[in-house]
């Protein structure tokens, strides 16, 4: 009997979508290029219930985590790499004071119980998204 | 109890600009997670988003609108203001503001104002 | 034409339950994002009635619930009354378009 796996091996299955926490460190842009390179890209968050649980992961391995959203482009105006804007009700997930944008910090992580704005080339663990396989049929 | 008002003209002539105000009271714009929207009805046509305010200052426009809409507000007055340039008879409708607060869902309504575009 | 596809009209009798669909793509519903439902009364502006997908606001009938799944979200109302006439909206948001859109909008007509 073959049974179905909706995501590759060592990814976690999470409402539809498999996710990727990387075991080495990048920069925030060869994280981007680490998720295309798999199919995937570097994490965007959809819903309240998608950032708690990746939040958790985060915390528990008590990692720094880039996900996809920086605001490169225009300072301020902090944008998911697919283009979307930051939405209102996820700013509420910035750590207090934070964004800051001490020394041209333009790229967000997972830093404890929230977001942080870091150096974009500072070497971080990061996480890989793509949508589940259909099991189907 | 949180209330929203929408005022403006009640008609205008195409190529003019439209300017609408939202009056609100029973929560503050300066509040983190708050925001504003405005959002239009055709008649007998469906709800359509226009803009939207947060009160971080951040704007958000309807990507087909965008050129013509400028969204603003003013804390102290409790105000949201929309203008809206090169008015055209399709842009008749029943104008709302709303407030959104967290999750995106607009959770109160003003009981919207007609505006009529027509020379 | 919306984003979010819904059925013109439906109908049902006092008493009946009737559902009503709410048609998405993968950059809106089945992104992630969380779909709402709005109840328009004939002349009024409309009225949040469900929010997060499945919560309702506080005065509420629990007559109304809803659900989503995968790309596509839907609204079931039960112990149908007649003043539960009126237009029925979903509405999410759409990673495409960088906006909020709202569904064409479903006539719910009781009968008798």
């Known amino acids: 009997e073959r049974l179905c796996h909706p995501c590759p091996w060592e990814w976690t299955f999470f409402q539809g979508n498999c996710y990727f926490m990387s075991n080495s460190q990048r920069n925030w842009h060869d994280s981007i290029t680490a998720c295309q390179e798999v199919g995937a890209q570097l994490v965007v968050i959809k819903s309240a219930e998608e950032q708690n649980f990746l939040q958790l992961q985060s915390s528990r391995s008590n990692r720094f985590t880039w996900m996809g959203l920086s605001d490169l482009n225009h300072e301020g105006t902090w944008q998911w790499v697919d283009g979307s804007p930051l939405l209102p009700s996820f700013k509420q997930y910035w750590n207090k004071g934070e964004p800051n944008n001490v020394g041209e910090e333009d790229c967000a992580e997972f830093s404890g119980n929230g977001w942080n704005d870091d150096k974009c080339n500072l070497a971080k663990f990061w996480i890989c998204k793509k949508s589940a396989a259909s099991c189907s049929g | 109890q949180v209330t929203l008002r929408e005022s403006g003209p009640a008609l205008v002539k195409p190529t003019q600009t439209l300017t609408l105000t939202c009056t609100f009271s029973?929560?503050?714009?300066?509040?983190?997670?708050?925001?504003v929207s405005w959002i239009r009805q055709p008649p007998g046509k469906a709800l359509e988003w226009l803009a939207l305010?947060?009160?971080?200052?951040?704007?958000y426009y309807s990507t087909s609108l965008k050129t013509r809409l400028t969204i603003s507000k003013d804390t102290s007055k409790n105000q949201v203001v929309l203008t809206m340039t090169n008015m055209d008879p399709v842009d008749t409708a029943t104008y709302y503001c709303?407030?959104?607060?967290?999750?995106?869902?607009?959770?109160?309504w003003g009981q919207g104002t007609m505006v009529t575009v027509s020379s | 034409q919306s984003v979010l596809t819904q059925p013109p009209s439906v109908s049902g009798a006092p008493g009946q339950r009737v559902t009503i669909s709410c048609t998405g793509s993968?950059?809106?519903?089945?992104?992630?994002?969380?779909v709402h439902w709005y109840q328009q009364l004939p002349g009024t502006a409309p009225k949040l009635l469900i929010y997060?997908?499945?919560n309702r606001p506080s005065g509420v009938p629990d007559r109304f619930s809803g659900s989503k799944s995968g790309t596509s979200a839907s609204l079931a109302i039960t112990g149908l009354q007649a003043e539960d006439e009126a237009d029925y909206y979903c509405?999410?948001?759409?990673?495409?378009?960088?906006?909020?859109?709202f569904g064409g909008g479903t006539k719910l007509t009781v009968l008798g």
């Open positions: 509405q999410s948001y759409d990673s495409s378009l960088s906006g909020w859109v």
């Open positions: 305010i947060d009160w971080d200052d951040d704007k």
């Open positions: 709303a407030r959104m607060a967290l999750r995106h869902a607009f959770d109160a």
């Open positions: 029973g929560f503050s714009l300066s509040t983190s997670g708050m925001s």
């Open positions: 997060v997908n499945s």
């Open positions: 993968s950059s809106n519903i089945g992104a992630g994002y969380d």
